[in-house]
């Protein structure tokens, strides 16, 4: 079975939360849910509320954790300027990190005189309703789960290209005489809570995770 990514590309470290009492709410809700034989979790999908049964232990499996997936009762903190942030992702479960910031810098942290070949932008996406799973099938993503009257929203930390052509001839710093170049968004798969019929289930879904430069030779170079 494929593994969800455990790290985020260098320069796009996801800032760790300030630990607040919010972090305990999901733990508490799960503890209570565990005491019941079958926990009823109301999942709101595309504006509808359905009662579905979820095994709370699903949230405790370490292999499911990805720093790019967050369950939170409130939106991750938005940071106007994240160039100064240099936090590392801690070992806590994704649903414990409730205050990670939105990253919207044009490229990762560089020393003076260094540039990115492609510019990327990273944001927390909290309104994902559908996604493509690892088998290429479109699946319904759970936007919110209601556990013991606490509504937890599912957020995804996505990174994509700001522009396919950071300079008008393609990627930055490429010899445009001999090379074609353009920036493109690449993807990875993360475990997310999705709807499987009437049940909530963890599935690998595809999300945008990086911006890379694609090169191909000019014919004049080949000739």
């Amino acid at each position: 079975e494929p593994h969800s990514e455990s790290n985020v590309p260098a320069g796009h470290t996801i800032p760790q939360a300030h630990w607040t009492k919010l972090q305990h709410s999901l733990d508490t809700a799960l503890r209570r849910a565990r005491s019941a034989p079958a926990a009823a979790i109301a999942a709101r999908v595309a504006g509808q509320t359905r009662n579905i049964t979820v095994d709370p232990r699903l949230f405790k499996k370490r292999r499911l954790r990805s720093p790019r997936v967050l369950f939170s009762t409130q939106p991750p903190r938005e940071a106007a300027d994240t160039q100064d942030l240099d936090f590392e992702v801690g070992g806590a479960a994704p649903f414990n990190r409730t205050h990670r910031s939105k990253r919207s810098s044009s490229h990762p942290i560089f020393h003076r005189g260094e540039f990115s070949v492609c510019d990327s932008v990273s944001v927390w996406v909290g309104d994902k309703t559908t996604a493509t799973d690892i088998k290429g099938k479109e699946v319904m993503v759970l936007g919110e789960v209601n556990i013991n009257n606490s509504v937890f929203k599912q957020y995804f930390f996505e990174t994509k290209c700001r522009d396919p052509n950071p300079v008008d001839s393609g990627c930055r710093g490429i010899d445009s005489k001999h090379w074609n170049s353009y920036c493109t968004t690449t993807h990875t798969f993360v475990k997310a809570l999705t709807m499987d019929g009437k049940q909530a289930a963890w599935r690998f879904i595809r999300i945008d995770t990086a911006c890379v430069c694609v090169l191909s030779r000019k014919a004049v170079r080949r000739a």
Partner: antibody, heavy 119, light 107 residues
């Protein structure tokens, strides 16, 4: 937005020369190969040659090598195609086209310049 | 030089029809195959680059496929504005070469 504007139609006698211009705007002129292509009446497209305005480097097809000269003027963002020793079979619409970033495709084309060679 | 054999040279079709044009290079061009649309009095337009990638602003009814020495342009549902001449072009090596064109006419 990117635009390529070519000079007007020309009528020339066999043996003469013609110089067609292609003025570019809306992008970094020096960083893209400019291609020249022609189309004889009722025929397909034929590649003539290319120039890289950044350093003036050129490539020509064997069919016109020695008769075609491509030049670029960075100050006016204009490329020129001069064809000498004209023959009747050079009668065609001449196009300039920018080679883009993708698979050596031509993403913007000029409107074309009709060159008629007739005695 | 790489020869590009395009077929058919012309075809008659109605609005809503599915249209397929093929292009066969004389040697493997590694997917460096582009398709253009030409209309009288208009500038030539790039439709598809690198065999199957839709150029910006081109309607999704246009699609391309193929590999090696066999490539296809498909218009899934012909629209009135699609009546034009279509050319294939190999961007693999110099000299660049083109197909002879396919004129799509109204039936």
């Amino acid at each position: 937005q990117v635009q390529l504007v070519q000079s007007g139609a020309e009528v020339k006698k066999p043996g003469a020369s013609v110089k067609v211009s292609c003025k570019a705007s809306g992008y970094t002129f020096s960083r893209y190969w400019m291609q020249w292509i022609r189309q004889a009446p009722g025929q397909g497209l034929e590649w003539i040659g290319a120039i890289y305005p950044g350093d003036g480097d050129t490539r020509y097809s064997q069919r016109v090598k020695g008769r075609a000269t491509l030049t670029a003027d960075q100050s006016t963002s204009t490329v020129y195609m001069e064809l000498s020793s004209l023959r009747s079979e050079d009668t065609a619409v001449y196009y300039c086209a920018r080679e883009g970033n993708f698979a050596n495709s031509f993403d913007y084309w000029g409107q074309g310049t009709l060159v008629t060679v007739s005695s | 030089d790489i020869q590009m054999t395009q077929s058919p040279s012309s075809l008659s079709a109605s609005v809503g029809d599915r249209v397929t044009i093929t292009c066969r290079p004389s040697q493997d061009i590694g997917n460096h195959l582009n398709w253009y649309q030409q209309k009288p009095g208009k500038t030539v337009k790039l439709l598809i680059y690198f065999t199957s990638r839709l150029y910006s602003g081109v309607p999704s009814r246009f699609s391309g496929s193929g590999s090696g020495t066999d490539y296809t342009l498909t218009i899934s549902s012909l629209q009135p504005e699609d009546f034009a001449t279509y050319f294939c072009h190999q961007g693999y090596t110099l000299p660049y070469t083109f197909g002879q064109g396919t004129k799509v006419e109204i039936k």
